[in-house]
Every structure is written in C-alpha cells, then in structure tokens.
C-alpha cells in the first residue's frame, strides 16, 4: 500500500519543482508535504503534473486541511480549482469577491457548473453579496442556481439580479424560494410601469400571493395560460371566476384544454359550477349548484 511506504533517502522535496513530475505515485504519497503544496500552489499550476499526480496532491491538501482549505490557499488555487468537488467547496469560508471571480474565470467552459454554484453559495453564506459582476462571471450558467441556494443565501442576492432571470430558470424552485424571489422581483421592478412591469414580473408569479394576483387582475394583463399554470395552487384557489376572467382576458378560453390538470383542476373544484357555466367554455368540475362549501381551514376560530 502506497501509504505505508517510506520516502526514499534524498527524495524529500523542499520545494515544488519539475523534478516531482518524475516521481512515482507512491513516492509522491510518501514524500510530499501538504503545507509545502499549499505554500507553492502557483508552481503546482505551472508544472505539467498528470491528473493522477494532481489527485495525489489534492489528497495531501485534504489531509492537511480536513476542515476545509483556508482562504489564503483558496485564493491561490488557480487551475487546481478544477480538481475540487462541490462537497469540498461547501466546507470553505470565502469572503473575498475577487477570489470568487478569479475561480469563476478558471471554471468557465469546463463543465464545472456545480463547483461554481457551490463557490458562490459559500461566499453568500459568509455574508458576501452576489453582484451583477459576479452573475456575469457565472456566465452561461442558467440562473436556476438561485434555486440551489439556501433561503438564507437568497436574502443576500441583490434585487437587481432579478433583471437577468428568465422563465426556465425558476422551474425547479421550491415554493419558499419562489416566494422570496417574487419579493425581490417586486422591489427590482417597482419603477417599471404597465405592461412592461407585467412582462418582467410574470416569471416570478409562482411566488405571488392571492392578494397580489387580485391586484394584478385589475390591470388588464391578459396573462397567458403557461404563466397561469405556474401560479401556486394555494394562491390560485382563492381567486373567483370573475377575477380569473379579468386576469386571463381573452386567454380564458385556454382553461378548457387544462381543465383536468393541476392547478386549473384544483381551481375548478373550488368554484361554483354556475359561475363556471357563465363563462360558456363547458368547464366541468365545479361545486354543484345548491351545495354549501364548508372551509375547515378556519375551524381554529371556533376552538
């Protein structure tokens, strides 16, 4: 076993240099010291070590810093960042935006989205701010990474970043994330008016409350069915037929094709059939006429 072998006499290196390229793997395991590697990380990146040798160096560094690499080393990682896993990164404490931007440059075009996202999350956890420069440094990575951040990390994301989010970016977001992002989007777009406001905010409407949707229905927005389907069920079921009619405008006809799918189906179940009939779309599934709906969600008021 490589771990058990002793370093041969005269083979102990005092600096990182090209001689190490010619060491057998077991010699690197036996002879190289993690603290020396950490001190001379720039040289590790300059010399053409094999990937196997680099993975031995990583093993050495991991043993030297079991609690995660110190920021002084992280700043020097350069191309070595490519050999670090997202799990490693989660142990780090990164406070310098320059460190983040440098490492994001290294990861660009390297199939390293997971590492890049973990790095930014780690920076946010340390109280850093995700500015637009950093989002640009994240480059082509879809902003769906916002959904990977913890809700606490999301608080650190400035509202201005919401301008860069596209509809597909939020597909995998939890309800809690959508709620937080919606609040940020409202604040980002507060000075935008009319239809332009709706165009921007509609990406985030999955986080909107019933109150917000009611307000929106007063503005002739003609919401398309795709956006409607992304609304959270809890908010949607609180809207009346008249309010949904105002919200969708001419797109109300598209409800028919979605009547057996959530969230449209859930909304239909909560409406009186007579109100649905007035739409003239042949929508079924409403509360039959003459039935009384008891909402057990308010029973606490009587206990």
């Amino acid at each position: 076993d490589a771990e058990q072998k002793a370093c041969p006499p005269g083979k102990e290196p005092y600096k990182v240099d090209e001689d190490l390229i010619f060491y057998q793997n077991w010699e690197l395991e036996a002879c190289v010291d993690g603290t020396m590697l950490a001190r001379q990380m720039d040289l590790v990146n300059e010399i053409p070590f094999t990937y196997e040798q680099l993975s031995i160096f990583k093993h050495k560094l991991d043993k030297t810093y079991p609690q995660g690499y110190p920021e002084s080393l992280i700043q020097q990682l350069g191309h070595f960042f490519r050999y670090v896993s997202p799990e490693d990164i989660h142990q780090w404490n990164v406070t310098s935006p320059d460190t983040v931007k440098t490492l994001l440059k290294v990861s660009k075009g390297q199939k390293m989205n997971a590492q890049a996202i973990a790095l930014v999350a780690c920076y946010l956890r340390g109280g850093g701010q995700l500015d637009e420069d950093m989002v640009k440094a994240l480059g082509d990575i879809p902003l769906s990474y916002l959904c990977d951040f913890s809700p606490q990390d999301l608080h650190s994301v400035p509202s201005s970043v919401m301008w860069l989010v596209g509809p597909q970016d939020l597909d995998k977001c939890s309800q809690r994330h959508l709620g937080l992002l919606y609040q940020k989007a409202c604040s980002a777009f507060q000075n935008v008016s009319g239809l332009e406001y709706f165009e921007k905010i509609k990406t985030f409407l999955g986080g909107a409350s019933v109150k917000d949707l009611r307000a929106l229905s007063q503005h002739n927005v003609s919401m398309d069915i795709a956006t409607f389907k992304r609304l959270q069920v809890d908010s949607l079921v609180g809207l009346s037929v008249a309010e949904v009619q105002k919200l969708l405008g001419p797109n109300i006809v598209d409800l028919k094709t979605e009547e057996d799918k959530s969230p449209v189906r859930d909304w239909l179940f909560r409406q009186h059939q007579k109100d649905l009939d007035r739409l003239g779309l042949g929508l079924q599934g409403g509360i039959p006429n003459g039935y009384l709906v008891l909402d057990f969600n308010v029973r606490e008021a009587f206990s």
Epitope: P48, T50, Y51, K111
Partner: nanobody
C-alpha cells in the same frame, strides 16, 4: 476522445539513434500535455519526457540524449533518442491528457531493443 498510435520502435545497436513517433487524432485541440513513458520488463512504468506548451522536461536518465518535440500541424509527437544504451530497452508509450475532461489517453506502445 483522443487516439494515439506510436511507431518507430525496433532493434538498434548501443550508441545508435532512433526516433519514435506518436500520431494523435480525435479531439487533439483539447490536449494539454504530451509525454513519453517507458516500461522495462518487471519494472514500473517510468516517465521519460514531457512537452507542455513550449516547455520540455526530461528524466535524469535521458537528459542530454533524448529530445521530445511536437509538430502541431501534423498532430504528431516525437522522441529523438541518441547514444542509446542497453538500459534504454523497454516498451515506450505515448500519453496525452486533455483540458476540461481531465482525462488521460495512452497509445498501445512500441518496443525499443538496444543490443550491446
């Protein structure tokens, strides 16, 4: 993927010369470093020489006798071996690694026999 094919091995007298070639094909644009290794019977595979950009590196045993070079237009790596000795007898392997995928590629090896 990168494919590597070595050629040029054979039997040579001690003190003679030989040039090994390694033709690379496939995703050659992504190659980071190229190397020659050798393995004598019953021993570990040893690194002989490396070319990385315009820098070259040699094992002590071959310094001053072997020269590694690369012709990018032909996607070919060379190892010019002069003043050959009996202890240079081995199977010589060409190796390349690529950027991004962090993968290693090997040729099938070519046998060099130095007779004294």
């Amino acid at each position: 993927q990168v494919q590597l094919v070595e050629s040029g091995g054979g039997v040579v007298q001690a003190g003679g010369s030989l040039t090994l070639s390694c033709a690379a094909s496939g995703s050659t644009f992504s190659i980071r470093a190229m190397r020659w290794y050798r393995q004598a019977p019953g021993t570990e595979r040893d690194l002989v020489a490396v070319i990385y950009g315009s820098s070259t590196y040699y094992a002590d045993a071959v310094k001053g006798r072997f020269t590694i070079s690369r012709d990018n237009s032909k996607n070919t790596l060379y190892l010019q071996m002069n003043s050959l000795r009996a202890e240079d007898t081995a199977v010589y392997y060409c190796n390349a690694d690529t950027i991004g995928t962090a993968r290693d590629y090997w040729g099938q090896g070519t046998l060099v026999t130095v007779s004294s």
